[in-house]
Interface confidence: low
C-alpha cells in the first residue's frame, strides 16, 4: 500500500501557498484528484511528487495515490483544504445524473473545515428543499441526497455561514432519471390497414419511456421515413409520436411498416401491413362443411368468416326452407370482430326441431356488392318402424315400413313364444334385407324404406320382429300372430319425441 507525505489525513492551507504531496510505493504510483490548475507532477521510480506553488480554492479536494502493480489494489488519500474567505465552496461538477433510489452526491467541497457547522443545502434562488428530502454532508465529498426521487430533479446550491451571512456555491443541477425497465413502449396503429387506391390513410407510430433519451422512427419496407416528430410528457412518461398522413394512397405505399424505438436498454419494434387494393372486396368463407348433418334435438352453430373492405353495410341470416317461412331469431345470431377487416358471424341453432332442417344463408353487403354463403342442414333421426300383415299376389306377407335418416337397414327375426322383443335365446331365424325398397327420399326429410317378408304359414306360438337401425339409433316392431288374426306390439318405449 502506498504512503502519502505529509502523513496527515487532512491538510489546510491558504490561497497562494505552496503545497507538495509525495507518494511512495513499492512500484510505480499514480495520483488521482480533483481537476484543478497549477499542479506539477514529478515521478521518480517508486515515488511521485505532486506540487503547486500557488494553491487556490479549486485545489480543495481529496488526492488519492494508487499503486497499479499492487495485487491488493490498495490506495492512500489526503484531503486538501485551501481556505479562501471569499470562496467557501469548490464545486467539482455542475450536473449530477443518477437513477431513482440511488444516492446522489452533489460535489460541493468545503474549502475550510471550520465552516462545517453552518452548512446547508438549498435550491436555487433561496428556495427551501422539497419536503422529505433526506440528505447528509461530508466536508470531503459534499452533500448526499439519499434515495433520490424523480421529483428532486432540481438546481441546488450549497450554503455556508460566513461571518453571519450565507454564502452560496454555484448551482448544481441534479437530474434524477426514472429507472428504465427496458426499451421504450411502442404502439403502431392501426395494426393492419387496407385502403382503396386514391383514399387517404394515416399510420401513427408512438413510443414512450420514463426517460426522454430515446429515438423513434417509422420505416416502410426497409426505408426510414422522414416524418416530423411530436413530443409530449404526460403520466410521468415522455412520448414521441410520428404520424404518417397519406392523402391519396397508391400501390407503392403498400407493404410492411415498422415502428422502431431504442434507448440505452435496447430496441423495440412492431410492424403492421398496409394493403392497397384496386376496389372494394367482400369474401365469405367457413371452416365448417357447408353440408351439415345433426341429430334432431341437438344444437349446431353455423359460423361464417367475413373479410371485407370497406366495412359491412348490412348482413343477415336467412332460412331458405323448405319447411316453413320462419326466420332465425336475431338473438341467436352473433357477430365478433377478429380485427378491423375480419369478422366472424355465428348463428346458434339449439335443440333442432324437424321443421328447422333446410338451407341457411348468410348474406353480407358492402360497397363491393352482395355475397352469400349457404349451409345445407339435414337432421338425423333414429328409425321408426311399423309392421302390417297383408296378402300380395295371394301370398301372406309381412310388410315392414322404417323411416329415419340416414337410410335405415332392415333385419327380420323369427323367435319362439310371444314377446315384445326377440332375445338371442329365442331367435329361430334371422333374415337381412340388404336392399329394402325406398318409398321416399326427399332432401332434408326422413328416408322411408319398405321390406317384405313372405310367410307361407304363420306359426301361432311365434313372434316376427322387424328391426331397423342407422347411425343414430334403432327401432323395432314385433308382430304376434293369434288365432283370430294378428296382434302387433310396438316397442315398449317411444324412442323419439321431436
Amino acid at each position: 500500500i502506498p504512503v502519502i507525505e505529509p502523513s496527515v489525513p487532512e491538510l489546510v492551507v491558504k490561497p497562494g501557498a505552496t503545497v507538495t504531496l509525495r507518494c511512495v510505493g513499492n512500484g510505480s504510483v499514480e495520483w488521482d484528484g480533483p481537476p484543478s490548475p497549477h499542479w506539477t507532477l514529478y515521478s521518480d521510480g517508486s515515488s511521485s511528487i505532486l506540487s503547486t506553488n500557488n494553491a487556490t480554492f479549486q485545489n480543495t479536494g481529496t488526492y488519492r495515490c494508487t499503486e497499479p502493480g499492487d495485487p491488493l489494489g490498495g490506495s492512500a488519500a489526503i484531503h486538501l483544504y485551501v481556505k479562501d474567505p471569499a470562496r467557501p465552496w469548490n464545486v467539482l461538477a455542475q450536473e449530477v445524473v443518477v437513477f431513482e433510489d440511488q444516492d446522489a452526491l452533489l460535489p460541493c467541497l468545503l474549502t475550510d473545515p471550520v465552516l462545517e457547522a453552518g452548512v446547508s443545502l438549498v435550491r436555487v434562488r433561496g428556495r427551501p428543499l422539497m419536503r422529505h428530502t433526506n440528505y447528509s454532508f461530508s466536508p470531503w465529498h459534499g452533500f448526499t441526497i439519499h434515495r433520490a426521487k424523480f421529483i428532486q430533479s432540481q438546481d441546488y446550491q450549497c450554503s455556508a455561514l460566513m461571518g453571519g451571512r450565507k454564502v452560496m456555491s454555484i448551482s448544481i443541477r441534479l437530474k434524477v432519471q426514472k429507472v428504465i425497465p427496458g426499451p421504450p413502449a411502442l404502439t403502431l396503429v392501426p395494426a393492419e390497414l387496407v385502403r382503396i387506391r386514391g383514399e387517404a390513410a394515416q399510420i401513427v407510430c408512438s413510443a414512450s419511456s420514463v426517460d426522454v433519451n430515446f429515438d423513434v422512427f417509422l420505416q416502410h419496407n426497409n426505408t426510414k421515413l422522414a416524418i416530423p416528430q411530436q413530443s409530449d410528457f404526460h403520466n410521468n412518461r415522455y412520448q414521441k409520436v410520428l404520424t404518417l398522413n397519406l392523402d391519396q394512397v397508391d400501390f407503392q405505399h403498400a407493404g410492411n411498416y415498422s415502428c422502431v424505438a431504442s434507448n440505452v436498454q435496447g430496441k423495440h419494434s412492431t410492424s403492421m401491413f398496409f394493403r392497397v387494393v384496386e376496389s372494394a372486396y367482400l369474401n365469405l368463407s367457413s371452416e365448417q362443411n357447408l353440408i351439415q348433418e345433426v341429430t334432431v334435438g341437438e344444437g349446431l352453430n353455423l359460423k361464417v368468416m367475413v373479410e371485407a373492405y370497406p366495412g359491412l353495410q348490412g348482413f343477415n341470416w336467412t332460412y331458405l326452407g323448405p319447411f316453413s317461412d320462419h326466420q332465425p331469431e336475431p338473438k341467436l345470431a352473433n357477430a365478433t370482430t377478429k380485427d378491423t377487416y375480419r369478422h366472424t358471424f355465428t348463428l346458434s341453432l339449439p335443440r333442432l326441431k324437424p321443421s328447422e332442417a333446410g338451407r341457411y344463408s348468410f348474406l353480407a353487403r358492402n360497397p363491393g356488392g352482395w355475397r352469400a354463403l349457404t349451409f345445407e342442414l339435414t337432421l338425423r333421426y333414429p328409425p321408426e318402424v311399423s309392421v302390417i300383415w297383408t296378402f300380395i299376389n295371394g301370398s301372406g306377407t309381412l310388410l315392414c315400413a322404417a323411416s329415419g335418416y340416414p337410410q335405415p337397414n332392415v333385419t327380420w327375426l323369427q323367435c319362439s313364444g310371444h314377446t315384445d322383443r326377440c332375445d338371442e335365446a329365442q331367435v329361430l331365424q334371422v333374415w337381412d334385407d340388404p336392399y329394402p325398397e325406398v318409398l321416399s327420399q326427399e332432401p332434408f326429410h326422413k328416408v322411408t324404406v319398405q321390406s317384405l317378408l313372405t310367410v307361407e304359414t304363420l306359426e301361432h306360438n311365434q313372434t316376427y320382429e322387424c328391426r331397423a337401425h342407422n347411425s343414430v339409433g334403432s327401432g323395432s316392431w314385433a308382430f304376434i300372430p293369434i288365432s283370430a288374426g294378428a296382434h302387433t306390439h310396438p316397442p315398449d318405449e317411444f324412442l323419439f319425441t321431436p
Epitope: 430533479s153 433519451n213 416524418i227 416530423p228 411530436q230 409530449d232 404520424t243 398522413n245 392523402d247
Partner: antibody, heavy 118, light 107 residues
Framework: EVKLEESGGGLVQPGGSMKLSCAAS????????MDWVRQSPEMGLEWVAE??????????FYAESVKGRFTISRDDSKSSVYLQMNSLRPEDTGIYYC?????????WGQGTTLTVSS | DIQMTQSPASLSVSVGETVTITCRAS??????LAWYQQKQGKSPQLLVH???NLADGVPSRFSGSGSGTQYSLKINSLQSEDFGSYYC?????????FGGGTKLEIK
C-alpha cells in the same frame, strides 16, 4: 402555473440596439424550447427566433428578416431567455412576445413593446 | 419558405351563428398546424394543435380539420367571448410562418 414575463422594451433610434429578457417559471425551463414572436399592424404575427433545449444542443433558428442582426440566447440557471437586437429598423417596431413551444406556442407572455423611431 | 394564406380577412357575424375560417399552405404541412385566438389587447392563446386537437380548456364548439395544404377552423354557435382575431400557423420546420389573421366582429 406557467409564467413568462418579458422586459426590456422601449423607444430606440434606427440603427440602435436593445436587449429583451424573458423570465420563466412554473416548468422545467432547461427542457423547453423558447421562441420570440412579434406583432405589428403591418406585419401581423411574425415568428422571430427560436432556441432549443440543451438536449438539442441549444440550436438556434431565425426569421430571414432578422438574421445577422438578432441573437437569441438562454440562461438555464436563471430560467431566462434573451433577444439581443442590433441594427434596429423601423419595421422592427411591434409587440414582442416570449413563448414556450410544446405542442404549439402553448404559453405566451404579455409582451413588451419596442418602438424604433427617430 | 412555406406561405400561409388565411381567409377571410374579416367576418361580421351574429351570436349563435356558425363560422368557418380557412387556411391554405403553399405546400403540404402534414397536419402540423396550430390555430390561435387573440382578443383585443391580449396575447394570443393556443386553440388547436396538430390541425385537429383542441388545446386544454378550449370549448368543444371549436373544431379543426384538414390535411395536406387545406385546413379550417369551425366555430359552432358563436358566443360573445369568441369575437376577436384568429391566426393559423404551421410547425413544419422553420421559419414558422403565421397566416394573415381573420378578424371576427359582431354584426
Amino acid at each position: 402555473e406557467v409564467k413568462l414575463e418579458e422586459s426590456g422594451g422601449g423607444l430606440v433610434q434606427p440603427g440602435g440596439s436593445m436587449k429583451l429578457s424573458c423570465a420563466a417559471s412554473g416548468f422545467t425551463f432547461s427542457d423547453a424550447w423558447m421562441d420570440w414572436v412579434r406583432q405589428s399592424p403591418e406585419m401581423g404575427l411574425e415568428w422571430v427566433a427560436e432556441i432549443r433545449s440543451k438536449a438539442n444542443n441549444h440550436a438556434t433558428f431565425y426569421a430571414e428578416s432578422v438574421k445577422g442582426r438578432f441573437t437569441i440566447s438562454r440562461d438555464d440557471s436563471k430560467s431566462s431567455v434573451y433577444l439581443q437586437m442590433n441594427s434596429l429598423r423601423p419595421e422592427d417596431t411591434g409587440i414582442y412576445y416570449c413563448t414556450r413551444v410544446k405542442v404549439g406556442f402553448d404559453n405566451w407572455g404579455q409582451g413588451t413593446t419596442l418602438t424604433v423611431s427617430s | 419558405d412555406i406561405q400561409m394564406t388565411q381567409s377571410p380577412a374579416s367576418l361580421s357575424v351574429s351570436v349563435g351563428e356558425t363560422v368557418t375560417i380557412t387556411c391554405r399552405a403553399s405546400e403540404n404541412i402534414y397536419s402540423n398546424l396550430a390555430w390561435y385566438q387573440q382578443k383585443q389587447g391580449k396575447s394570443p392563446q393556443l386553440l388547436v394543435h396538430a390541425a385537429t386537437n383542441l388545446a386544454d380548456g378550449v370549448p368543444s364548439r371549436f373544431s379543426g380539420s384538414g390535411s395536406g395544404t387545406q385546413y379550417s377552423l369551425k366555430i359552432n354557435s358563436l358566443q360573445s367571448e369568441d369575437f376577436g382575431s384568429y391566426y393559423c400557423q404551421h410547425f413544419w420546420g422553420t421559419p414558422r410562418t403565421f397566416g394573415g389573421g381573420t378578424k371576427l366582429e359582431i354584426k
